[in-house]
């Protein structure tokens, strides 16, 4: 049956700054197609459960699915197709008009180098360790890959690392979030944000670790220098990082203009899309040229930020100068001053 | 295993019509994801491919002779047909069948070829 | 069309070399390439499909890499039986072949 899990099925995604995430397309007969998130009698608006494509994350050398479901709504110049059947199939697929199909995206985790534990090491109080210390960020459930709450683990031993806002830790900070594979340090997480707000009913491998640590190097470069083990503390923070490295990205697409290549900016929280809003920390092209590169067009033509005379204009807004910056974006509920912004066309 | 045979007239006058038959075995053109086609190569040439046709009688031809290209098939009868029309000295050539799956897969099986030319 | 621009026609090694044919696409084809072997007198076998892939049977001493535009078929160790015509083949948009490289003993 020709599906996802043919072995020589041929997938990738695309539209989006990398190969883990982005609009489904696939190899069919004699080209690359892009799949409509309408396939298999879903409805363009549903949300599917990811771990069906798993196989198309493997293929990608990518981590485990994290969402699978409507993509964006945009003008797409090459092939469509909906598909019909189980999901995952593409025995009975027809070409769909542009203007009807809904793509599909894929959020797959990006690629760890190193895989590090599935499950945490069990809490014990055996003699001091002899295998290779290392980290573990635990996120909110559903929550980001390369974000959340630091865990360190010295042979058996494990738990998290005490933190005080005063602690002077950038060094650190980057050094750990190169350690678990995830870029460089962006920014401190409120512990609610990381996910450690602790749900009663959780299964005990999610309770709080036994072990504590603290800071004891901040310019460690080895990870056996970097914590001294302390006795568990009831109160104060925990270290929780976001790391350059985070996952899903925020998506961008251009509407409203002519081509795919030029429009008004819009991003996506969740399911949702809506206006970009203007931000002083982004007056550079920087975050143009990256909205550019996402949809697939050449360079930045030009932007302008269009009046917001209106006091009831809405929108999302980004406090970073890039959009792969953002981690999270943040309402605006009046007077959002939208951007308009042209493109190369690399397909004029 | 697979085999693909062409069979042909070996002969042919300028303007008239070529028609050739693919006879093969080892798959069906009613399993999803296959499709065969057509491929020609003029003795000492490159090769240059004509079209093709998939089990959901999806067709496809090469854009700059689509005019002149008709591809069919009898998935029960395990064959697949091509003419040519208004045929020139130019399309003396060796035609060759072949298999490819819809994941593109490369032509993966190929028949020993059926030789036409085309003189007046 | 895409042109696939085989520029050596000839190549000339000796049994034991190790040889790579080169392959280039006027645009960017991905990954959708193969690459198939034709002896005189007998029809092309495919070696190589989505530009690194082996097919069945095919001898672990061709492979095949690049992307984009530049595409490279490799032979280590050559054996007296690869001596013949190679074609690379883009699939990414229809089909189109290359004008082959004939590898020759020197």
């Known amino acids: 049956r020709l599906s996802w899990y043919d072995p020589d099925f041929q997938a990738r995604l695309t539209r989006s700054n990398s190969k883990c995430q982005g609009q489904l397309e696939v190899y069919l007969k004699d080209g690359w197609h892009m799949v409509c998130s309408q396939s298999w009698g879903r409805s363009s608006k549903q949300w599917e459960d990811p771990s069906q494509a798993s196989k198309v994350c493997q293929r990608l050398n990518c981590g485990v699915p994290l969402s699978l479901g409507p993509f964006l709504v945009t003008y797409t110049p090459q092939s469509s197709i909906i598909c019909y059947g189980q999901l995952g199939s593409f025995s009975n697929c027809s070409h769909s008009r542009n203007d009807m199909c809904h793509s599909l995206g894929l959020t797959c985790l990006e690629p760890q180098k190193t895989t590090p534990p599935t499950t945490r090491p069990p809490p014990t109080t055996t003699p001091e360790p002899t295998a290779p210390p290392r980290l573990q960020l635990v996120a909110q459930s559903g929550g980001q890959h390369c974000a959340g709450v630091v865990e360190f683990y010295s042979g058996s031993l494990g738990g998290t690392i005490s933190y005080e806002a005063q602690d002077k830790t950038q060094d650190l900070e980057n050094f750990l979030c190169n350690n678990l594979q995830c870029g460089s340090f962006l920014k401190h997480l409120p512990e609610t944000e990381a996910g450690r707000a602790q749900d009663p009913g959780e299964p005990r491998e999610h309770q709080p670790l036994p072990i504590q640590w603290k800071i004891q190097n901040s310019s460690c470069t080895s990870l056996e220098h970097c914590f001294r083990k302390i006795k568990p503390q009831k109160s104060g923070r925990v270290l929780a990082l976001l790391c350059s490295g985070f996952q899903p990205k925020v998506q961008s697409r251009l509407v409203g203009g002519s081509s795919i290549c030029e429009g008004t900016v819009e991003v996506r929280q969740g399911a949702q899309w809506a206006a970009l809003c203007d931000s002083s920390s982004a007056r550079s092209s920087l975050r143009w040229e990256e909205v550019c590169r996402e949809q697939q067009c050449g360079s930045v033509n030009s932007y302008r930020v269009l009046d917001a005379g209106d006091p009831t204009s809405r929108g999302l807004f980004c406090p970073h100068q890039k959009l792969s910056q953002c981690h999270e974006l943040w309402e605006r509920n009046s007077y959002c001053k939208k951007v308009f912004v042209t493109c190369q066309d690399p397909n004029p | 295993q697979v085999t693909l045979k062409e069979s042909g007239p070996g002969i042919l006058k300028p303007s008239q019509t070529l028609s050739l038959t693919c006879s093969f075995s080892?798959?069906?053109?009613?399993?999803?994801?296959?499709?065969v086609g057509w491929i020609r190569q003029p003795s000492g040439k490159g090769l240059e491919w004509l079209a093709h046709?998939?089990?959901?009688?999806?067709?496809y031809y090469n854009p700059s002779l689509k005019n002149q290209l008709t591809i069919s098939k009898d998935a029960s009868r395990d064959q697949v047909f091509l003419k040519i029309t208004n045929l020139d000295t130019a399309d003396t050539a060796t035609y060759y069948c072949?298999?490819?799956?819809?994941?593109?897969?490369?032509?993966?099986?190929w028949g020993q070829g059926t030789t036409l030319t085309v003189s007046s | 069309n895409i042109v696939m621009t085989q520029s050596h026609k000839f190549m000339s090694t000796s049994v034991g070399d190790r040889v790579s044919i080169a392959c280039k696409a006027s645009?960017?084809?991905?990954?959708?390439v193969a690459w198939y072997q034709q002896k005189p007198g007998q029809s092309p076998k495919l070696l190589i499909y989505w530009t690194s892939t082996r097919h069945t049977g095919v001898p672990d001493r061709f492979t095949g890499s690049g992307s984009g535009t530049d595409f490279t078929l490799t032979i280590t160790n050559v054996q007296s039986e690869d001596l013949a015509d190679y074609f690379c083949h883009q699939y990414n948009s229809y089909n189109t072949f290359g004008s082959g490289t004939r590898l020759e003993l020197k």
């Open positions: 046709i998939w089990w959901d009688d999806d067709v």
């Open positions: 072949v298999r490819r799956r819809a994941t593109g897969t490369g032509f993966d099986y």
């Open positions: 080892g798959f069906s053109l009613s399993t999803s994801g296959m499709g």
């Open positions: 645009q960017d084809v991905g990954t959708a």
